[in-house]
Interface confidence: low
């Protein structure tokens, strides 16, 4: 069974950025270079993450917090805490295991990451296509054909949605 730490445990007094050094009579010692402890009472410090290769440092390691990485331009983060970098593609493409591939007809991708998605089917909502789709943009649906009968007021197409954020270039 796990023994509960006694209230007198001297290690509980060691703040973040230090560790309880068993080799020095449980004195609170500062974390060595390139290591950190983010909570108090730690018996060891953790090694700082190194942002190498396609990773670049977004936040330097400190004695109390780990380094944070992002990706070099032309790549974007994947996974928790940016555990991987994946190559950007151009708008109108998706990344396959053999590189960037143009979206098939009837699909689009308006970002530099992610997959190609099907164009909206306007007819499912009883609407008509106002602006045709492209590899980079979804179709714009307009009023239903019945609404376009003579005498009906003209309809202004909706403003395009703001483009989603991209990886830094």
């Amino acid at each position: 069974f796990e023994r509960t730490r006694s209230l007198q445990d001297p290690c509980s007094n060691c703040p973040a950025g230090t560790f309880c050094d068993n080799n020095r009579n449980q004195i609170c010692s500062p974390c060595p270079p390139n290591s950190f402890s983010s909570a108090g009472g730690q018996r060891t410090c953790d090694i700082c993450r190194q942002c190498k290769g396609v990773f670049r440092t977004r936040k330097e390691c400190s004695s109390t917090s780990n380094a944070e990485c992002d990706c070099t331009p032309g790549f974007h983060c994947l996974g928790a805490g940016c555990s991987m970098c994946e190559q950007d593609c151009k708008q109108g493409q998706e990344l396959t295991k053999k590189g960037c591939k143009d979206c098939c007809f009837g699909t689009f991708n308006d970002q530099k990451r992610g997959i190609c998605r099907p164009w909206t089917n306007c007819s499912l909502d009883g609407k008509s296509v106002l602006v045709n789709g492209t590899k980079e943009r979804d179709v714009v649906c307009g009023p239903s054909p019945a609404d376009l009968s003579p005498g009906a007021s003209s309809v202004t197409p909706p403003a395009p949605a703001r483009e989603p954020g991209h990886s830094p270039q």
Epitope: G53, V54, G74, F75, Q87, K97
Partner: antibody, heavy 126, light 107 residues
């Protein structure tokens, strides 16, 4: 890790064809994107073409269109480059190279050539 | 096609020297720029990808910088094994194109 091993040197007469092979080991050919690059004696590096996305025909440099054919045999993990109507200026070392392949397991893919085959010298002479 | 221009085409340097090679693209290529080293009779070897990322196993004396149209490969302290020809290559668009090469020779 992936390795590319090419077929041996060839000597051909003008007008003939040559077919160079590139055997993949360490990974399967279907996991890779193989490109072909050539280098004439004392000259720079020239991309000939290669396989980009999945399930699509290879893309060829304009200069070689109609003369080059690139194929893959996934059953033997071997890529091939055939060049027809050879002329003396086709004398060069021909390399296969893997594109967009992360050889070191860090979870990335990108547009660079690594690793390369050892090269195949093709000499065209009458 | 995107044209890649390297300078100088050749240079003479001594062991321990700091060497800089530049590569200019005819249009913006973001960070899609790679550097290779080639020794006589050998295939090119990838040194730097994505303009500034050091390929695994490549010594840290090699570094790359730049984005857009202007890029630099720097060897901080030239070693005997670094005498070779260096090529830049853009992968922003098809066809991928290479610079004409920079030969680094012993002074």
């Amino acid at each position: 890790q992936v390795q590319l091993v090419q077929s041996g040197a060839e000597v051909k007469k003008p007008g003939a064809s040559v077919k160079v092979s590139c055997k993949v080991s360490g990974y399967t050919l279907s996991e890779l994107s193989i490109h072909w690059v050539r280098q004439a004696p004392g000259k720079g590096v020239e991309w000939m073409g290669g396989f980009y996305p999945e399930d699509v025909e290879p893309i060829y440099a304009r200069k070689f269109q109609g003369r080059v054919t690139m194929t893959e045999d996934t059953s033997t993990d071997t890529a091939y480059m055939e060049l027809n109507s050879l002329r003396s200026e086709d004398t060069a070392v021909y390399y296969c190279a893997a594109e967009g392949f992360d050889n070191y397991g860090s979870g990335i893919r990108g547009n660079w050539f690594d690793p390369w085959g050892q090269g195949t010298l093709v000499t065209v002479s009458s | 096609d995107i044209q890649m221009t390297q300078s100088p085409s050749s240079l003479s340097a001594s062991v321990g020297d700091r060497v800089t090679i530049t590569c200019r693209a005819s249009q913006s290529i973001s960070s899609y720029l790679n550097w290779y080293q080639q020794k006589p009779g050998k295939a090119p070897k990838l040194l730097i990808y994505a303009a500034s990322s050091l390929q695994s196993g490549v010594p840290s004396r090699f570094s790359g910088s730049g984005s857009g149209t202007d890029f630099t490969l720097t060897i901080s302290s030239l070693q005997p094994e670094d005498f070779a020809t260096y090529y830049c290559q853009q992968s922003y668009s098809t066809p991928p194109t290479f610079g004409q090469g920079t030969k680094v020779e012993i002074k």
